[in-house]
Interface confidence: low
């Protein structure tokens, strides 16, 4: 467990008065419909709130929306609906906020049936002013910003046209027709699939994958017989139909689609799917669905090229294409992921990996907790976490697990303690060491959020009744204070704090209901006076991440290196501050077999760190298709895990020879690829 000073819960002094002076109420002059909230930029304090209200009339639906703006983190709001000419904004497109601190915002308006095209309102000054623009098409999707240049936008039209703007939506050009899916890649590249015959649905598996690197002046066909494609990290993936049957396989490219290799993954049939669970520049977690309506599949982890895959986890819960999976990247500690498996008896169990999918284990049972009715042995069981799947099944779970990169080691989640996830009312658990150990933090379901990089945790009870109390903790969830933020309870709808967990402001959203009307209301609480002083050196202590055996010289080594962090002492009540940067000291570890994955043609028997040859490939030359050339592999079965930084120690031999023979893998060889210009 992370360092903490065991002490009786001390009350934060005079907190009621301090918080009362920093609690700001705003009542919105709206009938209660729906409300959506977006932060514009980072550390700007600018929030946009869009409220919409639908009145279903006999012949049509009459809609009304209002736009509000705050520039002080939600303490005060100004009605700016007149800036968008009191137009009804379509909520299904949301508010398209530009990347980084561009200050750009696009709102898509509802237009009457007979109009030639849609209408947008654009702002490039953090929503101080808006420009109305009529579009030459009806948008099907929200405007998508290029990650590299926020002036470049793309959108699909209801008639499957791909439209691009180079001047932040002022002027639009249709660069291609018959487009099913379009995505920005790196360097302002656009990838998209097109159909030749009937429609996206009819041509599924016969689509073409195209690329334009100059916003539609010229195009290159980079794939045929495409079912779908996806981008993850530096990898471009395409699922491609096989020549002879209805199965499809994953192909991967690391050069924007110029050359492709077939991923060493199982092929899937019509009813199955692939899903990229997580990807970075080093590697990919790929889910491959099982045949049949099982609701589970297998997780594979890739090598650094995205080609060779190791089986990581069996019976991984993933309901259907685009369905629910509990796969969660624990962002507060490197290498940690949590997900759910569907066991043989159809119960759902939580698994955790601390080494990027190398090994999975159950979550340790929290101290001082009892095993529930799902446990066969009342003394031996595990913690099971509720995530997306529980929420989709309408369980009493208001929030998914929460972790933040700058709140090192902290993970908060709803869960139950037993042999499997239970449908009974869950409690909230916290880990302060990235998931190695857990303690019950709050009884019953709550909404929760992390402020000031972990210096404060705020929670609100999940209740069907109106609420007026917020709970907060300054010691990573050990002790809690309660604050009554209003005399008149509200029907709570959500907690909002600035993304990134650096803020000290929290907004409580809800509505009040009187005899005749109901209105939106927000309470913004600033905790700056609770954390009165800035943290100093003495407030921090050294913590070794992934430490399980302090006696071992290699303790804390994960993916070839260990990291020591400066962590805030639990007993320190002070501000990390908005400019807080996580301080860490990495040190390289010696290589062991654990730092290598099994190479193509090899596998690891269970509970063994050695890689052995697959029986069916014994004595065969290991040749595979890579970048359209046949390669010959000389290996003793090991390949370094992507992102592993170990040095020295064990060093298995590996060599790849180019056989100078052309090969294709049910896919485009370079000669077949064509280019064209407009």
């Amino acid at each position: 467990s992370a360092p903490g000073e065991d002490e009786e819960c001390g009350r934060v002094r005079d907190f009621v008065a301090k918080l009362a002076n920093n609690t700001h109420q705003h009542v919105f002059d709206d009938l209660r419909g729906s409300v959506s909230l977006s932060w514009v930029g980072d550390s700007t304090g600018v929030i946009l709130v869009l409220t919409t209200f639908h009145v279903p009339l006999v012949i049509m639906t009459f809609g009304q929306s209002k736009l509000y703006r705050s520039e002080d983190y939600g303490k005060n709001f100004k009605d700016i609906t007149d800036l968008i000419n009191n137009t009804f904004i379509r909520t299904e497109f949301g508010m398209a906020i530009g990347p980084e601190n561009s200050g750009k915002v696009v709102l898509t308006a509802e237009v009457s049936g007979g109009s030639r095209g849609g209408r947008i309102f654009r702002s490039s000054d953090f929503a101080k002013n808006f420009v109305q623009t009529d579009l030459p098409f009806h948008p099907l999707t929200q405007m998508m910003y290029s990650p590299q240049n926020s002036d470049y936008l793309l959108a699909l039209s209801t008639e499957n046209g791909l439209w691009v703007s180079k001047n932040f939506g002022g002027k639009w050009e249709e660069i291609h027709k018959a487009v099913c899916l379009a995505k920005w890649g790196s360097d302002n590249t656009i990838f998209f699939t097109t159909y030749a015959n009937g429609s996206c649905k009819a041509d599924l598996g016969a689509l073409e994958l195209w690329r334009t690197s100059d916003l539609g002046k010229s195009f290159k066909t980079i794939g045929v017989k495409i079912y779908s494609f996806g981008l993850g990290g530096r990898f471009l993936f395409a699922s491609v139909m096989a020549d002879k049957d209805t199965t499809r396989r994953i192909h991967v490219s690391t050069d924007q689609g110029d050359t492709w290799s077939m991923a060493q993954l199982p092929s899937v049939g019509q009813e199955q799917f692939y899903s990229i669970l997580a990807a970075n520049d080093d590697m990919v977690f790929m889910h491959v669905d099982e045949p049949g309506d099982t609701g589970f599949g297998t997780i594979f982890t890739s090598d650094d090229r995205g080609i060779v895959y190791s089986k990581s986890l069996d019976r991984h819960l993933y309901t259907t294409t685009g369905g629910e999976t509990d796969f969660t990247n624990v962002t507060s500690l490197r290498g940690v992921y949590i997900t759910s498996v569907l066991s043989e008896d159809n119960s759902i169990q939580t698994m955790i990996t601390f080494d990027q999918g190398g090994r999975w284990t159950h979550l340790r049972k929290p101290e001082n907790s009892e095993c529930d009715a799902t446990a066969k042995n009342k003394n031996e069981c595990s913690l099971h976490i509720h995530a997306s799947y529980s929420i989709s099944q309408k369980l009493n779970v208001p929030m998914a697990p929460l972790s933040e990169p700058n709140a090192v080691g902290i993970v908060i989640a709803h869960g139950s303690v037993g042999d499997a996830i239970s449908v009974m009312v869950p409690d909230v658990y916290i880990s302060d060491d990235g998931g190695y150990s857990w303690t019950k933090m709050l009884e019953g379901p709550h909404y929760y959020t992390i402020l000031d990089s972990g210096g404060i945790i705020v929670a609100i009870e999940h209740s069907s009744r109106p609420i007026n109390v917020i709970k907060f903790s300054t010691d990573e969830g050990q002790c809690w204070q309660t604050y009554t933020f209003t005399r008149d309870p509200i029907y709570f709808t959500g907690l909002a704090s600035e993304p990134g967990a650096r803020s000290m402001n929290i907004s409580i959203w809800g509505f009040t209901e009187s005899f005749l009307t109901s209105q939106w209301v927000s309470y913004t609480i600033d905790f700056k006076d609770i954390l009165e002083r800035n943290c100093e050196e003495k407030d921090y202590t050294i913590w070794l991440a992934h430490s399980t055996d302090p006696e071992d010289y290699e303790d804390g080594c994960i993916l070839g290196y260990k990291e020591q962090f400066l962590r805030l002492r639990k007993s320190s009540v002070c501000q990390n501050g908005r400019d807080y940067v996580v301080t860490k000291q990495p040190s390289i570890c010696l290589c062991s077999l654990e730092d290598f994955l099994c190479d193509f043609g090899y596998y690891r028997p269970e509970n063994d760190s050695k890689c052995v040859e697959q029986p069916e490939l014994k004595g065969h030359d290991l040749e595979f298709c890579l970048y359209g050339r046949e390669e010959h592999l000389t290996t003793n079965g090991y390949r370094k895990i992507p992102g592993d930084k170990c040095q020295g120690g064990v060093n298995p031999v590996r060599e790849v020879k180019d056989l100078k023979k052309k090969c294709t893998s049910n896919f485009l060889s370079p000669e077949k690829q064509n280019s064209k210009s407009n």
């Epitope: 043989e344 159809n346 037993g418 996830i421």
Partner: antibody
């Protein structure tokens, strides 16, 4: 639609065995437990046990242990309950019932789909 | 084994009445309790699972409450098709056990 169809009525002599079948359709057979429940004339419901069609695993009520065998044939989506050494007080309607899976969680397995029942009469 | 005791064993009521049936477990069963309706010559039908969750397709006039040892099934406004026998069932611990049943008759 989802349904369970059971085999027809049986008349047996004391000491004999009876095997009742339950054919499932309209859902993934392996994904839900199959329970067996019986009801003697004019009496309440009595749980006998379950079979997990996925793995073939079983759990029987203590009262029937040693006399009951629950099996399944996944190729034809059918569950079976065989009761041996029949006595006259085994005269009852025998039901198969699908355990409500509730998307995978253990939640007390309410039984959400029932067969029409098979009447077993034990008489000399 | 956990004993499930239902009360009353029978009751007479009129269409439109509010009817309450209780079920008591001999030890705590958390919320692992289900309610069924059975009509003569027919198989039981699941009404409520996990103490208070309404099974899909079941009218909203049926509701369940309780946890631990005491549970209640309520029919807010009795309809002609509701005259039947009602059973509670626990499934916290094996063996699963049913209550003795409550017969709801026309007054």
């Amino acid at each position: 639609q989802v349904q369970l169809v059971q085999s027809g009525a049986e008349v047996k002599k004391p000491g004999a065995s009876v095997k009742v079948s339950c054919k499932a359709s309209g859902y993934t057979f392996g994904a839900y437990y199959m329970h067996w429940v019986r009801q003697a004339p004019g009496q309440g419901l009595e749980w006998m046990g379950w079979v997990n069609p996925n793995s073939g695993g079983t759990r029987y009520a203590q009262k029937f242990q040693g006399r009951v065998t629950m099996t399944r044939d996944t190729s034809i989506s059918t569950a079976y309950m065989e009761l041996s050494r029949l006595r006259s007080d085994d005269t009852a309607v025998y039901y198969c019932a699908r355990g409500k899976r509730s998307s995978g969680w253990y939640e007390g397995y309410g039984m959400d789909v029932w067969g029409q029942g098979t009447t077993v009469t034990v008489s000399s | 084994d956990i004993q499930m005791t239902q009360s009353p064993s029978s009751l007479s009521a009129s269409v439109g009445d509010r009817v309450t049936i209780t079920c008591r477990a001999s030890q705590s069963i958390s919320s692992y309790l289900n309610w069924y309706q059975q009509k003569p010559g027919k198989a039981p039908k699941l009404l409520i699972y996990a103490a208070s969750s309404l099974q899909s397709g079941v009218p909203s006039r049926f509701s369940g409450s309780g946890s631990g040892t005491d549970f209640t099934l309520t029919i807010s406004s009795l309809q002609p098709e509701d005259f039947a026998t009602y059973y509670c069932q626990q499934s916290d611990v094996s063996p699963i056990t049913f209550g003795g049943g409550t017969k709801v008759e026309i007054k």
